[in-house]
Interface confidence: medium
């Protein structure tokens, strides 16, 4: 057969769907690989062909579109399952071709089982809500295109196993779930079950997402440097190890890059000749506020090193701060026999 542009197995788009539920899967060619859409391709005389490789098999085979009740069908660039079965798991390929052009991509499809509490191996999207921020909403995800706007589905929301009814601060609003006030106790997995009729049959769509309550932008502050500070002086003798922690608190800020770095005499440690190492650790609070600690370490400090300026810097979307460490050379204790004796006027 003639050459075909093969984009390989697109593992970035690992598609997971629940067993015994409808699934509509768009051919990834038009979304991620080609610069034209299905309509353009179709009107140019290109044909979209689907085939698959079953789990643990190497053999590519055509998809059976003649199953009872059209269980698997193709509509434009979408492959439909009404509904899925466990053994539909495998690698699916969509190929766009005519006599002179060919392009194809494969992607993995995993049909997943869930228990009565919606637990499953499904990777869950995370939705972040700001703590104590006022009314916020989450929306039942990935249900577009399953039924026409004329169909009015029923939607039931659950937190874990429990149907959401008269919850303390959570109100179901159809496809939306409203949090009158988000609190840490609202952390958890929320599931919407969308039920709709189609051709005399009833289908269910189950969508679970994780809600994580995070720090509110109303409470966000610029980075706070806890250490170094004015109360601690790093007093060392030459030859000793110098350890200076830079500990910085960052308020949670959506999509903010938190940075901590040291400068020595105004230069980054990498740009200076002294033997310095820096170790970083990061911890998070329950609302995803972040504490970063960078420990600057000089194994055998010299008297030259003890005269240098050590400054901890921190930056977030809220601002940039810096704090110098107080470093000084320890004054050697007087040697009694000589210094003190001289002090008492001994000759």
């Amino acid at each position: 057969s003639e050459r075909c542009d093969d984009w390989g197995l697109d593992t970035m788009r690992q598609i997971q769907v629940f067993e015994d539920e409808p699934a509509r899967i768009k051919c990834p060619l038009f979304e991620h690989f080609l610069k034209f859409n299905y309509s353009t391709a179709h009107s140019a005389g290109l044909t979209l062909i689907w085939y698959w490789t079953r789990q643990d098999r190497d053999l590519e085979e055509p998809i059976n579109f003649r199953l009872p009740e059209n269980r698997i069908s193709k509509e434009k660039d979408v492959l439909w399952f009404r509904p899925t079965l466990l053994n539909d798991t495998g690698n699916y390929t969509c190929m766009l071709r005519n006599t002179t052009y060919c392009s194809k991509v494969a992607f993995p499809l995993e049909v997943v089982q869930k228990d009565s509490c919606f637990n499953s191996p499904m990777k869950l999207p995370v939705h972040k809500l700001y703590i104590e921020y006022g009314i916020q909403r989450i929306t039942c995800p990935n249900v577009d295109g399953y039924f026409p706007s004329s169909v009015k589905p029923t939607i039931t929301w659950y937190m874990g196993c429990y149907k959401i009814q008269n919850f303390n601060n959570v109100i179901p609003e159809g496809m939306n779930l409203s949090f009158l006030i988000a609190l840490i106790s609202n952390n958890g997995n929320y599931t919407c079950v969308v039920t709709y009729p189609e051709n005399g049959r009833t289908f269910h769509l189950t969508r679970t997402l994780t809600v994580k309550v995070v720090g509110s932008p109303k409470n966000a502050v610029p980075p706070v440097i806890h250490s170094p500070n004015d109360h601690v002086v790093y007093e060392k003798e030459p030859g000793e190890e110098l350890l200076i922690p830079c500990t910085v608190y960052f308020s949670f800020l959506m999509d903010s890059r938190n940075e901590v770095w040291w400068t020595i005499d105004g230069k980054k440690p990498d740009d200076i000749t002294i033997d310095v190492t820096i170790n970083e650790s990061i911890s998070h609070s329950r609302t995803e506020d972040e504490t970063r600690t960078q420990i600057l370490s000089i194994k055998k400090v010299t008297s030259e090193d003890l005269k240098r300026s050590y400054v901890c810097h921190a930056r977030s979307a809220k601002g940039e701060v810096a704090k110098a460490a107080k470093v000084k050379q320890k004054v050697p204790a007087p040697r009694y026999t000589v210094e003190l004796a001289c002090g008492f006027g001994a000759t």
């Epitope: 921020y133 109100i171 609003e173 159809g174």
Partner: antibody, heavy 125, light 113 residues
Framework: QQLEQSGGGAEGGLVKPGGSLELCCKA??????????MCWVRQAPGKGLEWIGC?????????YYASWVNGRFTLSRDIDQSTGCLQLNSLTAADTAMYYC?????????????WGQGTLVTVSS | ALVMTQTPSPVSAAVGGTVTINCQAS??????LAWFQQKPGQPPKLLIY???TLASGVPSRFSGSGSGTEFTLTISGLQSDDAATYYC???????????????FGGGTEVVVK
């Protein structure tokens, strides 16, 4: 987008103490099911606004009442007719008021962007 | 039950002046507060929601601020058409099976001189 109120006749509702009355509110220019909530507020003559309750106008059965309602009033909705109703029972003279329906033109529960024209309910013997 | 206390009432100011109306919630309602304007014989009109977000079509002369239990509506560049009664509405954040409370303040009459 508007809310049209009905119930109690064109001149409003004159009801005897202990009596009942149903007020309804029809959404026109938008689908009630896509606008989520139908809420009710009343206003006694010369007084301020008083929240009665809200009913979700979609597929679930969320209904919330002010604690003072004590089961005397009932909210219902008919999605197909884009209508929400307020059933008033065991009425007393203190229930004499202008009754408004309101729906969120914004956001969902707790917002009242659209209002009906109001229906005056008079409880008198 | 949630109680919303509105002050002062009435309040008067000259055309072009500034009016500030306060609303205090008996519970922490975070930013779940709306402001309404009502003129005689008319239903209320939504001005502000989420404590500070201007509703569609409302002039920027109206502004809201506050969160928690203390809220303020400010009307600057007062116009004669602003003569009306103003109400705050708090959405309480705790729902219990025996009822939830959204509560209006008692109203503030604004007189334009």
């Amino acid at each position: 987008q508007q809310l049209e109120q009905s119930g109690g006749g064109a001149e409003g509702g004159l009801v005897k103490p202990g009596g009942s009355l149903e007020l309804c509110c029809k959404a026109s220019g938008f689908s009630l099911s896509s606008n989520y909530w139908m809420c009710w507020v009343r206003q006694a003559p010369g007084k301020g606004l008083e929240w009665i309750g809200c009913i979700y106008a979609g597929s679930s059965d969320s209904t919330y009442y002010a604690s003072w309602v004590n089961g005397r009033f009932t909210l219902s909705r008919d999605i197909d007719q884009s209508t929400g109703c307020l059933q008033l029972n065991s009425l007393t003279a203190a229930d004499t008021a202008m009754y408004y329906c309101a729906s969120p033109g914004y956001g969902g529960y707790g917002y009242y962007g659209l209002w009906g024209q109001g229906t005056l309910v008079t409880v008198s013997s | 039950a949630l109680v919303m206390t509105q002050t002062p009432s009435p309040v008067s100011a000259a055309v072009g002046g500034t009016v500030t109306i306060n609303c205090q919630a008996s519970e922490d309602i975070y930013s779940n507060l709306a402001w309404f304007q009502q003129k005689p014989g008319q239903p209320p009109k939504l001005l502000i929601y989420d404590a500070s977000t201007l509703a569609s079509g409302v002039p920027s002369r109206f502004s809201g601020s506050g969160s928690g239990t203390e809220f303020t509506l400010t009307i600057s560049g007062l116009q004669s058409d602003d003569a009306a009664t103003y109400y705050c509405l708090g959405v309480y954040t705790y729902i219990s099976p025996d009822g939830t409370d959204n509560a209006f303040g008692g109203g503030t009459e604004v007189v334009v001189k």
